[in-house]
């Protein structure tokens, strides 16, 4: 085919941006290109071409008419992580190709299983009490808070310190007795540990 005067090579006019998305949620990596003839767009992750519904109708990834890559749901397991990585879109026509900036897609996860559940504690009034938990693995790293008898623990109480997975009460009162739960939270949601009972005995 002859080169037509009005034809021009592709250029990327909208680059994809870095994303952090919860597992199972939809996501879009944007890409828009100009060129004449209209360029075709393909996506690559880590140097491998990304399969979309154009290759397999059952794919959870769709190439939109705009050139954007749409994920019906982000797929991410313990060992298989097909969607996580660094993506580029490539626009091509007969005059050449244009490559977008890199865009990283990170997957936010929060597993179900606490690595350590808090244990029951029994102390005398006035003694210190310590409960410890390790939240489920997560990305971003989950923050830890505590509930007592179903309500968020008042960490403004100067006797109470929450550091890492440790809940420390420097000197216990009878009113501290109750059922405690460790809560791990990130952008995915929250997970509650098994219940641990704090028993405060009269001296």
């Amino acid at each position: 085919s002859r080169l037509r005067q009005e034809d021009f090579p592709p250029r990327i006019v909208e680059h994809p941006s870095d994303l952090i998305v919860s597992k199972g949620e939809p996501a879009t990596l944007n890409c828009k290109a100009e060129g004449r003839p209209t360029p075709t767009i393909e996506w690559y992750k880590g140097g491998e071409r990304v399969e979309t519904d154009k290759d397999d109708p059952r794919s959870h990834r769709m190439l939109l008419p705009s050139g954007s890559l749409f994920f019906l749901r982000i797929v991410h397991g313990r060992r298989s992580k097909p969607d996580e990585g660094v993506y580029v879109c490539v626009a091509r026509n007969y005059l050449g190709e244009a490559v977008s900036h890199n865009a990283s897609l990170e997957v936010a996860i929060l597993r179900d299983d606490f690595r350590q559940n808090p244990s029951d504690v029994m102390v005398a009034v006035g003694e210190p009490a310590v409960m410890e938990c390790q939240p489920p693995r997560g990305h971003p790293e989950p923050t830890i808070s505590w509930k007592k008898d179903g309500s968020p623990l008042d960490d403004k109480d100067e006797r109470i310190t929450i550091r890492g997975g440790k809940l420390m009460i420097t000197y216990t009162r009878k009113s501290d007795a109750g059922k405690y739960v460790c809560v791990g939270t990130n952008m995915v949601g929250e997970r509650e540990s098994e219940v641990a009972e704090l028993t405060v005995l009269e001296r």
């Epitope: 399969e51 797929v75 179900d112």
Partner: antibody, heavy 118, light 105 residues
Framework: EVQLVQSGAEVKKPGASVKVSCKAS????????MHWVRQAPGQGLEWMGW????????KFPQKFQGRVTMTRDTSITTAYMDLSRLRSDDTAVYYC???????????WGQGTMVTVSS | DIVMTQSPSSLSASVGDRVTITCRAS??????LNWYQQKPGKAPKLLIY???SLQYGVPSRFSGSGSGTDFTLTISSLQPEDFATYYC???????FGGGTKVEIK
Amino acid sequence: EVQLVQSGAEVKKPGASVKVSCKASGYTFRGYAMHWVRQAPGQGLEWMGWIDPRTGLTKFPQKFQGRVTMTRDTSITTAYMDLSRLRSDDTAVYYCARESGDDAFDIWGQGTMVTVSS
Amino acid sequence: DIVMTQSPSSLSASVGDRVTITCRASQKISSYLNWYQQKPGKAPKLLIYAASSLQYGVPSRFSGSGSGTDFTLTISSLQPEDFATYYCQQSVGLFFGGGTKVEIK
């Protein structure tokens, strides 16, 4: 079409090694963990370990450590399982299986029969 | 290692029967449990993942339930093609249960 195609049946002598291949097609090879599972005649399924095709890192249950090697060649989207110091009780059908993002083995190879006999 | 115990190891049933197979984990595994079907001379086939999610293309007569340590695979109305061996697998440590063979009565 997503599929795993394994190498053909093997007959080996005790003490020898066997290398089984598993050619993946129809999906992004580097994105999915690859596992090996075996099944002795008339017995159940026994998980042998897995390889991360992206990094080449492997993990095996204690039973197979030191005797099994798992490798991959990303340029030809093929995983390999090498079992050494073969014994008669290694006679089994060996399967490769892809692990989905839902932590389950959703695609299996057709199996490779390995017979260990003197 | 987490040990998976399936019961029964075999059962006889008729077409149309409701069949239940159980799998017990030696420690809590949340919902990290899968079920597979295997026919003689064939590779296993995934039926259920994450304890209760039906794999694409699997008939709705198959269902899974349970969490923690006790899990169940149910076939609501047994069909001739369902006579096979069924395996549970925990997806944390990846070990399989011993299998349940479903035979024709």
